[in-house]
Amino acid sequence: EAHKSEIAHRYNDLGEQHFKGLVLIAFSQYLQKCSYDEHAKLVQEVTDFAKTCVADESAANCDKSLHTLFGDKLCAIPNLRENYGELADCCTKQEPERNECFLQHKDDNPSLPPFERPEAEAMCTSFKENPTTFMGHYLHEVARRHPYFYAPELLYYAEQYNEILTQCCAEADKESCLTPKLDGVKEKALVSSVRQRMKCSSMQKFGERAFKAWAVARLSQTFPNADFAEITKLATDLTKVNKECCHGDLLECADDRAELAKYMCENQATISSKLQTCCDKPLLKKAHCLSEVEHDTMPADLPAIAADFVEDQEVCKNYAEAKDVFLGTFLYEYSRRHPDYSVSLLLRLAKKYEATLEKCCAEANPPACYGTVLAEFQPLVEEPKNLVKTNCDLYEKLGEYGFQNAILVRYTQKAPQVSTPTLVEAARNLGRVGTKCCTLPEDQRLPCVEDYLSAILNRVCLLHEKTPVSEHVTKCCSGSLVERRPCFSALTVDETYVPKEFKAETFTFHSDICTLPEKEKQIKKQTALAELVKHKPKATAEQLKTVMDDFAQFLDTCCKAADKDTCFSTEGPNLVTRCKDALA
């Protein structure tokens, strides 16, 4: 229903704490360079204004849209042009164009320093002094680095963060309590970020229909006992929630997500038998829990998919009458039977089925034409299955770091023009798929691997879009979202690439590498590996292994030496010479 004052409505629905958190996230995602203090001041002003509207919905400006209110706040920031350049031009526009303009200026790779975690004692002190400000800083720092982070889910991670600090800051050994727990939250949050970015990309590039198809497949896998009408309702609601969050309408998004969680918990009987544990939790935990709830047990008596979609004499008539609905029922029926497939694969199968009907239903004898469609799915299913087997075997043989290096070599050969930092980041993320998915039971591997890889490759595409350098990457990124992963997997060595000339300084290291944390050391070594491949794109695995082993040995020796600087300056040039010889 329509409300006199949208801001009062949202404040009442969400409560002050969540309202303030979401407004802070919104501002931090739009203006990514502003300090916490600048945003906190705006948030307080907006909150005070919301309270006046709660008291009197007819008060001045209370009837304005949230975009108008928030946009006016952002545009009133001093020195906007100096700090944000052409983003300031958005402020010359009227709504809704102004908000669209802000969205277009969101930066997926802002030049901000990595979010460093303070040491335990300092963290606990500032948390105890002012928990609200501490959590505000967390929301601000994550939101500005991840401008499409799913806002209600970020509130959930902040809550997790809060609980960990409350618990660990009371312990004697704060460090060993905090580190593994916060690392766990960080890892989950980073995965959540790339997954949500993929959803927003789907929405932005291909519209609501594409996202809704994704939602139907995913929900059908999770809730195989729910009927098609129920799945359609959930998919429609979920699409609305995600559209709002991707569009910067964070208050509406969080409010609608809470409504959806409420609906699911009130209708467990027609959705799934696995929801009760989630539904017993408080709001943020409940919604999070529902988003990753285990699959319900599949009905035992499901008929073969062929009955309705191949053998039925009315396939073409039914398809012609309501194409999207007929394809939706196909996707639903196929997905509920295959929790062991990735959503990307299910969407590829639905696309193949659609193309087959489009072709066959226009012919003289459609059944003869589409009769073999299910058999034609086989190669589409085998390809990702083989990908999972090959890559998990390799991961088990090499471990995470070695697996990352193998992927780094492979992707540098596919797209050597891409910047080394982007290649290293991508390979490290792609390589984590092993740890994340290869240890799972067989029937969970494929959905885990492929849907995770698709999300990481979406980030590669977003970064490449900013500065396109590789025709290979452009080709894979400009196709449909579900075809990206197979496209990248099929890429081979880029024959058009002119190898980089060998620069000794690229492979010159100093003693400061010895004191770096293990992760940073790995990144340095992986940077060198990518540069080696750019110098010799056709180097064999054996050649590269020889060089990298030599490099590791050199670091180990010099970092243990009494006079590290001398060791690096004398042994370094020798290492460079040996590398050149090994790759000659």
Partner: nanobody
């Protein structure tokens, strides 16, 4: 809201022809499949013909195949049914229809329908 208005019905002798039209509004006609169904006195709805959004897929009931032709003009938001070699058993009220969200495909009682146009084939 969805509106469908049939016209073109009338009394015709066996072997004669009629062309029915259906003017559509209130929905995305050019992306919707369309259907002709008919209902003889005292009988249920009978499916006659279906045409896809882009006219590439066309289907007819066996009883009318070879005699009736369905077509559409997406620029004019109009659906047509050309009926040749009419027989007395074609006598019925003819409705144009389109899928209604939430209904089952092929469950024509639940589709959006117009008021219908009467076709009577008699000598």
């Amino acid at each position: 809201q969805v509106q469908l208005q049939e016209s073109g019905g009338g009394l015709v002798q066996p072997g004669g022809s009629l062309r029915l039209s259906c003017a559509a509004s209130g929905f995305a006609f050019s992306t919707s499949g369309m259907v002709w169904v008919r209902q003889a006195t005292g009988k249920g709805l009978e499916w006659v013909s279906t045409i896809s959004d882009d006219s590439r897929i066309i289907r007819y009931a066996d009883s009318v195949n070879g005699r009736f032709t369905i077509s559409r003009d997406n620029a004019e938001n109009t659906l047509y049914l050309l009926m040749n070699s009419l027989k007395p058993e074609d006598t019925a009220v003819y409705y144009c229809a389109t899928y209604r969200a939430g209904s089952r495909i092929g469950s024509y009682e639940d589709y959006y329908r117009g008021q219908g146009t009467q076709v009577t084939v008699s000598s």
